[in-house]
Amino acid sequence: MGSAALEILGLVLCLVGWGGLILACGLPMWQVTAFLDHNIVTAQTTWKGLWMSCVVQSTGHMQCKVYDSVLALSTEVQAARALTVGAVLLAFVALFVTLAGAQCTTCVAPGPAKARVALTGGVLYLLCGLLALVPLCWFANIVVREFYDPSVPVSQKYELGAALYIGWAATALLMVGGGLLCCGAWVCTSRPDLSFPVKYSAPRRPTATGDYDKKNYV
């Protein structure tokens, strides 16, 4: 596969991953109440996210509310907020770096420098994936640990929410996409013949006598 194709595929995966990461960051479903106690008078589901939590009553009535204060949040939610937002912003920076290093753009002159910029974009996406993976795994670890902790009351036990799975899928896409961008940049430097297929040739200069080639005339 040519480096241009790797670049395009990598960028598409990274953009989808970035969208997934934004979705995971915003969704109030990082942890969802586990129904273990069937004696609870009124069944209700609680969803908790990084910015708000939602309660769905047995009647189907759902109410969501943004957290009252950053201070009122546990340390891991505060850290997860910072890391996830950091990853989203890093992906935004990585997009511009990748576009600057792309073979189909003219921000940077073609050559080793351009390939290095493209490589930097790929590395940034890889870092972005790793950065997002930290809060996702940390959160999941806490949820699972508390689920199996006998000292934690049943009403306080949670299960992994949809946002975590979306987040994991997004980080996978970011890392695969970042890897492809790195490969594309590497191919471009080591095998120039496999780089962007469209070649432009300079217009032919007129001869010294000022006459053009006869075949230009009908």
């Epitope: 509310k65 009122a72 000292s151 306080q156």
Partner: antibody, heavy 118, light 107 residues
């Protein structure tokens, strides 16, 4: 089971300080904040302050100058200290766990009845 | 500070009746209101938060409603164990403030 058990003196001399320890079980102080509220017949329920899970503290401005709240996460204990008590500080003092993310005390402690008298 | 006013100090009711306890805030608290029940010699227990969300394990005969400055706690069919003191609290801003309480008693 979420529990908050309080220990402290029942009688305090005027101008002396009040110290109450709130020992929690069934939840971690790393994840939840602990509020302090008092209840007196004359003034009803008054919010005094909160020790957040991250370690920062919010105080009611009316008590800020003579109030101190600290905690020991490893011992699951929150410490409440109020200085310069007067007769109108006679009340039941409660510690209460904060609803995660919100300014809502959701599970309340047993309460410590404090009388300020000489 | 936001002042929470519970206009009725006492409310008389009978078992099976529907009763509504009201609370008025001195400014818009945008549904950041909680309701507590306190039985004699016991600590308060949380019933409702966010104006209308029942706390875990609270029977569905308790419902909260309201917006802006006016809030209501309704007990659809009063049971003997519901005879207690009820307090509203705003969690819109610090310092958190409570209403003076409404005592629900038998007629």
């Amino acid at each position: 089971q979420v529990q908050l058990k309080q220990s402290g003196p029942g009688l305090v001399q005027p101008s002396q300080s009040l110290s109450i320890t709130c020992t929690v079980s069934g939840f971690s102080l790393i994840r939840y904040g602990v509020h302090w509220v008092r209840q007196s017949p004359g003034k009803g329920l008054e919010w005094l302050g909160v020790k957040w899970s991250g370690g920062s503290t919010d105080y009611n401005g009316a008590f800020k100058s003579r109030l101190s709240i600290s905690k020991d996460n490893s011992k699951s204990q929150v410490f409440f200290k109020m200085n310069s008590l007067q007769a109108d500080d006679t009340a039941i003092y409660y510690c209460a766990r904060g609803l995660d993310g919100y300014y809502v005390p959701d599970v309340w402690g047993t309460g410590t009845s404090v009388t300020v008298s000489s | 500070d936001i002042v929470m006013t519970q206009s009725h100090k006492f409310m008389s009711t009978s078992v099976g009746d529907r009763v509504s306890i009201t609370c008025k805030a001195s400014q818009d608290v945008s549904t950041n209101v909680a309701w507590y029940q306190q039985k004699p010699g016991q600590s308060p227990t949380l019933l409702i938060y966010w104006a209308s969300t029942r706390h875990t394990g609270v029977p569905d005969r308790f419902t909260g409603s309201g917006s802006g400055t006016d809030y209501t706690l309704t007990i659809s069919s009063v049971q003997a164990e519901d005879l207690a003191l009820y307090y509203c609290q705003q969690h819109y801003s610090t310092p958190l403030t409570f209403g003076a309480g409404t005592k629900l008693e038998l007629r």
